[in-house]
Every structure is written in structure tokens, then in C-alpha cells.
Amino acid sequence: DSSKWVFEHPETLYAWEGACVWIPCTYRALDGDLESFILFHNPEYNKNTSKFDGTRLYESTKDGKVPSEQKRVQFLGDKNKNCTLSIHPVHLNDSGQLGLRMESKTEKWMERIHLNVSERPFPPHIQLPPEIQESQEVTLTCLLNFSCYGYPIQLQWLLEGVPMRQAAVTSTSLTIKSVFTRSELKFSPQWSHHGKIVTCQLQDADGKFLSNDTVQLNVKHTPKLEIKVTPSDAIVREGDSVTMTCEVSSSNPEYTTVSWLKDGTSLKKQNTFTLNLREVTKDQSGKYCCQVSNDVGPGRSEEVFLQVQYAPEPSTVQILHSPAVEGSQVEFLCMSLANPLPTNYTWYHNGKEMQGRTEEKVHIPKILPWHAGTYSCVAENILGTGQRGPGAELDVQYPPKKVTTVIQNPMPIREGDTVTLSCNYNSSNPSVTRYEWKPHGAWEEPSLGVLKIQNVGWDNTTIACAACNSWCSWASPVALNVQYAPRDVRVRKIKPLSEIHSGNSVSLQCDFSSSHPKEVQFFWEKNGRLLGKESQLNFDSISPEDAGSYSCWVNNSIGQTASKAWTLEVLYAPRRLRVSMSPGDQVMEGKSATLTCESDANPPVSHYTWFDWNNQSLPYHSQKLRLEPVKVQHSGAYWCQGTNSVGKGRSPLSTLTVYYSPETIGRR
């Protein structure tokens, strides 16, 4: 109604002796600004005087004067909207009605607010969700209808008297609608929390106890089970009896059904807390557990592994692999079902016991032909010895052995002759099925293993044959020694070993691949000028002026042959390569080792390749190879290869030794 002043504030405020009250308040006057404000305690209207009687807690007039005793009560408002009040400290006798007497220029109003001050701090109130289930997160709420800026408080959660680890979220409200302090705790209860006491404790700023509220947790959970077995180790022999008992240590609500499972599958007609297995067989070995259900769901016990022991069954032998190739490794496996596992094995080769072989597996690292035959075994455990099974056959295959190439016609052979050769061998498994000849040619094979060469050429220098089954075995080549004029005459630099550079002593060799007859003469020339008649051309100290085009000639009684022109260049591929090691060739593990590839090359080396003692290339291409941290396993010989536009050069092996650190030695 338009003739009323409009106020907003909490209807009732709660506090206790010695605390404080903060009263959030807003108002709207009918006209103009507030000119006078009086705060009464339990005001009563006096009809005779047309005024309110009662204790005046606070008084403010136009001149703004406030009596000094009013410091406990503060008006924090203003002349047109805010009427917020504070009483600090608040006393028991402040309980009752507060009256806000407001006067503007022409209007008056009395607004009443209830104040409830208790002798001692009143308890907070814990709110729980309607149902709590194990491992499902719930929010616990603790609510206190109190908050005041001048009196800080805290709400602490305890479980069975011990502060809870989970972080609580505390919120406060000091508004015209509500005044409260609330603490919310997110919590995932376990079944073991069932029946436990949760406390919300109200404390002052120093942590001193003021009041509390408690509740008992009702945590719904699946049945918690313990399984017991007789005998306790669950190891029996065939024909023995076994008893398993299922005990419920906790269930909320009460359990309804019980069942037993073996290897995850439910056992029929087993719905009691005791499982009796009479005269067990080996098939009853497995993992057993009991399952008990309630309205929340099923609970399972831990698994009991029942082992039914029996003597080994007849054994079989598995060979990896047959047929086996000579030189390969073969493994024999004795397979026999038994519990406990066999502790001893006896192996037989062709019916004869193999001495010193008592393991489940027999490993032959390098198979030889005499290893072929029948292998069988017998398994043994504490309950007895099994029977020997049928055994398994090992077939050892190998390439043809001692292959030779034999020349059938008389020596010497001259260019144009007809030559007959045969290919012979000693033994073979499987049998020889074909022969191969090197080099290939358009030659006749009149019968298996025989080769006929019509009109033999100068270049038929050597012939080799191979006898083949699944593999080919090559004989050493035989020389035909066909007589012909010198062939493949070429200039070869024999000194220095690496590329030439100025000042070196240089020797050029006039080479030819072969000559029959062997008696020959040599001639050297450069730019048409005769230089010498020896097989070598020597320079004591080479100079750039010696560069040029060189040729040599070789004569025998059949004819003469000239080399191609050979260009002498004073350029060289990397040489004098060596691997140096820093800090030295002996380094302690965990430290750093730097290997440097040092070389002499023109043009300079463009990149390097590094190798280990097995000639395996390492993924580095620069001059330095850094191993950090270096390990004992890195010990070994390393070498490097340098490459430039002319060619490659390689170093000799350089050995790095990595020794154990004192720490490692101390641990051993």
C-alpha cells in the first residue's frame, strides 16, 4: 500500500552472548530524507503520549549528536536507502524486538526486527542426502543461521573425532534476504565408513570449540566377504576332499543370495556358505570365489586357486624345427601335463639315454648330421614318473660336401681347344638334383655334372661348379691356364698407397691380367716419348709438372698390347686416417668420451662415417663422435671412414676401454 514505508531485512537474526549481530537492511521513505532515527529495544506504544516507550539503544537526530554509550550499537545506514545495523558485542538481554523508529519531515515509521540471542553458541545443522552408497560422491552440508563481520567463525568437519582430509567449501550470506554460514564437503564414503560419526564443529577464529552437530553415516554397500579353504594352501591330490567357507564381514542392507564361481563361471546348485568338493579330479583345478548379493549389488570374495596334483601324463616331444639345417640351432621340448610341474626329465636319442639332459628343454646350438634320429623323453614329479611317448624325428639337412671341379683333358690348354670338366661331391642330404657352373656360357652339358667347352677362349681362365640340393655348394675354381697374348694392360699406381701429392715418391706399375706365355717386355711413354723398359716407372719426388697422360705396352711371343692412357693427378682421397680419443682411450663409465677422426685429404673430407667393432655404422657424419654418458658396454674397437670428392679412406681400429666407476664397484 502506498501509505507504507518499504523495508527489506531478515525477519529474525540469531546470535549468542558475546558475539555480534550484523543486520542487513534497506528502506524507502514515503517522502524526503531521514531526519531522525531511534533504535528501541522492545518498544511499546504509549497512547497517552502518542510516543513509543522502551530502551533506546541508539539515537540520531538532525544535529547528528550520538550519546557516547551508544558505541556498542552502530547505525551503518544513510538518509534514504540503507538502514544496516551492527551490535557488537551482543548480550543475552538484547533478545526480543528491535524497533527502528524512522522520521522524515512529514512521516514516521516503526519497523520491527526479531533478535534471538542465546546464552551459549547454538549448534549448526548437518544435512545429509537421503541415501549414501559406497564410492559414490556425496555432498555433506553444515548450516549455521549466523554471520557477523565483527565475529569470525569457522566450521570444521570431523570423522570419528578426526579432522577430515577432504577440502570443505565455506560460504557466508549477509544479505537482506538471509544471514547464514554454510560449509559443504564433497566426500566419497567407503563401506568401512558405515556407522561412523560425522561431526560439524563450530569454532571461533582461534579454533576454540563453540558448538557442534553430529550424524551417524548409513553407507549402503555390497556384501564384503572372506573365503576360507581347508586345506589352507588349497593344494590337494586327486581323490582328496576340499571345503571352502564364505564369511560375510559386512553387508548393508542384509544379503539375499549366495553363489559360488569357478574360473568366473557360476557353479550349479551351490547356494550355501559352504562348498564341499569330494574326491576331486584334476579338472577341478581352478580359481574359486563366492558371490553374495544384496539390494546394492553383488560382492565377491578374493579368489582361491585350487591345485589338484597328479603324476605326469605320457610325454610328447616337440622339435623346433625339423627338418633342421646343419649349423642351425634346434630346441627339443618335452611336453607332459602334470601338477606340480615336472622337476626332472630323462631324454633319449635313438632309444639311448642322453647323459646330463634333465631339463624340460634340450638346446643344441649347432646341429650336425649325426644329431639326426628319434628323440623321446620321460617326465617326473613328486607323485611319480610318466611314460615315454612315441618320440619325434629330427632330420638334419646339409648342402653337398667336398665338391670338386675336375678337368678331364690333358694340360696345357690352348685357346680354341675343347675342354671337358666334371663336378664331383662326397655326400648330400637331400640328394643332389642339379649342378651350376661359373662363369655362365653357351656350353654343352652332355650328362648331369659334366661340362664341355668347345673352342675355349682366352678369357676362360677359371671354372667352378656347384652341386645343388636345397642349397648349392661351390667347388674351388680350377684354372684352365689358356695361353694367349697379354690382356687387360693397364697403368697402376703402386706408390704411394693413397692419392698423390707433391713431393711424394711415386711408382707406376704396368699391369696386365695375364699372359701365356709369361715372358714379356715392357715400354713406357708419355706424350709419345719413350720413358723406360721396366715393369715400373719411378719418380723420386713427384711435382705438378709430372702430371699428364701415361701409357705402357706389354709384349710376349704372341703379340703386344697397349694400356689406355692414364692421367696422373696430384689429388688424393682421405688418407692416414686414425681415431683419437679424448680424454684418452680409457674412460670411466658415466663420463664423456669424444672420438675424433683425423685425416689427411685434398680436397678436405666432406663427411665421415663411423663404425663399431662389428662394422656396424653409427648414426654420425661429423668429425667428432661424442659418447655421453659412456657405458662399459661401449668398450670396443671403433674405426672411421672419411669421404671427399676423390674417394674414401678408412682408419685402423682404435680401442676404447670403459671401466667401472668406484660407485659401481662398491655396489658389487
Epitope: 666432406s606 663427411h607 663399431d612 667393432w613 662389428n614 656396424q616 655404422s617 653409427l618 648414426p619 654420425y620 657424419h621 661429423s622 667428432k624 661424442r626 659418447l627 654418458p629 657405458k631 658396454q633 661401449h634 670396443g636
Partner: antibody, heavy 121, light 107 residues
Framework: QVQLQQSGPGLVKPSQTLSLTCAIS??????????WNWIRQSPSRGLEWLGR?????????DYAVSVKSRITINPDTSKNQFSLQLNSVTPEDTAVYYC????????????WGQGTMVTVS | DIQMTQSPSSLSASVGDRVTITCRAS??????LNWYQQKPGKAPKLLIY???SLQSGVPSRFSGSGSGTDFTLTISSLQPEDFATYYC?????????FGGGTKLEIK
């Protein structure tokens, strides 16, 4: 064909250890013609090689100087995989982490893992 | 450490254009230079190894050249799927290092 499959957490707290695994299919971690690398990528650092493990006649490791004191790369021959451990991480270690194969024939990273975004926070 | 400097850092081009990206090493790395392509949210993909060898399955419009310290990647005729970031990488010595990348954008 060769594939690399990465696994490991995407969030690591500062000062803790970052652990990632790279499972290899179609090749062997013990190959004597390959090296197995870890590389990371962040807006501030770009692509950054962290280190590698490889087998020739024995196992070798190379590490970048920037992480040398904190990094371990280990092969696991039984599972045909290799792993990265980076200790004492800071927010500067936040990046996408890749594993990659480097083959002798090309000396290049020819096969890469799918990448794992790791945030240090 | 060997520093790898790529230029330009970004490049705008149109489909059908011929594009060249350069990479410079702070010291000679012979021909141990590789090129990669990376698209957002994906791992880098090998395009060129050993400076000029085309990785199997990579279109022939990509080519690489150079040795020593200066290298180039050329795309002869840009296709829509080629817009990505390109990186060079040296495998000459450890630590293995990458260039800062060149972002190729549609003009």
C-alpha cells in the same frame, strides 16, 4: 608398415617426472639400421630434438645438452618399445612430444608417432 | 651446435605457383639435410632426405638441392594440399637441429 604409437599422461605437475612410451610395430627397437628419437615442439622453441637410443653391437644414447641432466631414453626389447623420462619438469617443458624413427639409409626421421600434448601445470 | 636458418619465415602464394624455400647451415653439413612438411595438429612428414632424394610416396613436384651450407626446397606447381609449414633439419652431427620453419599460406 612401420607404425609408432605414443602413450602417456597429458598433464604433469611441476618438479615431477614426465614419462612417455612409444610402441613400435613393423620394425624392431633392436634394429641395427635405425635410431629411435624423441622430439618436442612448442611455440617458443619450435621443433627441438631431445635425444635418441639405438642398437648396433650394444645400446647407445645421445641427448641434447639442454636436457642432458634430466633425460633418460630407454629401450624395452621385450615389449618392442622405447620410453622418455624427463625429470624435474617446469612449465617451459610444456610441448607436443613426438617419437620418430631415423634410418641409416636416409639419416632422416621417416616415421613419426602421433604426438602427445604434455602440459606442465 | 649447428644452427639452421630458414627463409622466408612465411610466404604467400597461389595454386600453380613455383615456390622456393632456402635453408642455411652455420657450418658445412655435406648433403645431410632433410625437408619436412607439417600440417596443423599433425606430426611432420618427411619429403626429401640427403638434400635431394625424394621420399617414397611424395609427389615429384617436390625437389631439393644443395650441399655444404646452402640448400633449397622447390615446389614446381603448388597444389591446394601443399599449404602447410615446412622445416629443414640437419643430420650431420648431434644435436640434430631443425630450422625455424616456413609457413606457406594461400595468397
Amino acid at each position: 608398415q612401420v607404425q609408432l604409437q605414443q602413450s602417456g599422461p597429458g598433464l604433469v605437475k611441476p618438479s615431477q617426472t614426465l614419462s612417455l612410451t612409444c610402441a613400435i610395430s613393423g620394425d624392431s627397437v633392436s634394429s641395427n639400421s635405425a635410431a629411435w628419437n624423441w622430439i618436442r615442439q612448442s611455440p617458443s622453441r619450435g621443433l627441438e630434438w631431445l635425444g635418441r637410443t639405438y642398437y648396433r653391437s650394444t645400446w647407445y644414447n645421445d641427448y641434447a645438452v639442454s636436457v642432458k641432466s634430466r633425460i633418460t631414453i630407454n629401450p624395452d626389447t621385450s615389449k618392442n618399445q622405447f620410453s622418455l623420462q624427463l625429470n624435474s619438469v617446469t612449465p617451459e617443458d610444456t610441448a607436443v612430444y613426438y617419437c620418430a624413427r631415423e634410418v641409416s639409409g636416409t639419416s632422416a626421421f621417416d616415421i613419426w608417432g602421433q604426438g602427445t600434448m604434455v602440459t606442465v601445470s | 651446435d649447428i644452427q639452421m636458418t630458414q627463409s622466408p619465415s612465411s610466404l604467400s602464394a597461389s595454386v600453380g605457383d613455383r615456390v622456393t624455400i632456402t635453408c642455411r647451415a652455420s657450418q658445412s653439413i655435406s648433403s645431410y639435410l632433410n625437408w619436412y612438411q607439417q600440417k596443423p595438429g599433425k606430426a611432420p612428414k618427411l619429403l626429401i632426405y640427403a638434400a635431394s632424394s625424394l621420399q617414397s610416396g611424395v609427389p615429384s613436384r617436390f625437389s631439393g638441392s644443395g650441399s655444404g651450407t646452402d640448400f633449397t626446397l622447390t615446389i614446381s606447381s603448388l597444389q591446394p594440399e601443399d599449404f602447410a609449414t615446412y622445416y629443414c633439419q640437419q643430420s650431420y652431427s648431434t644435436p640434430l637441429t631443425f630450422g625455424g620453419g616456413t609457413k606457406l599460406e594461400i595468397k
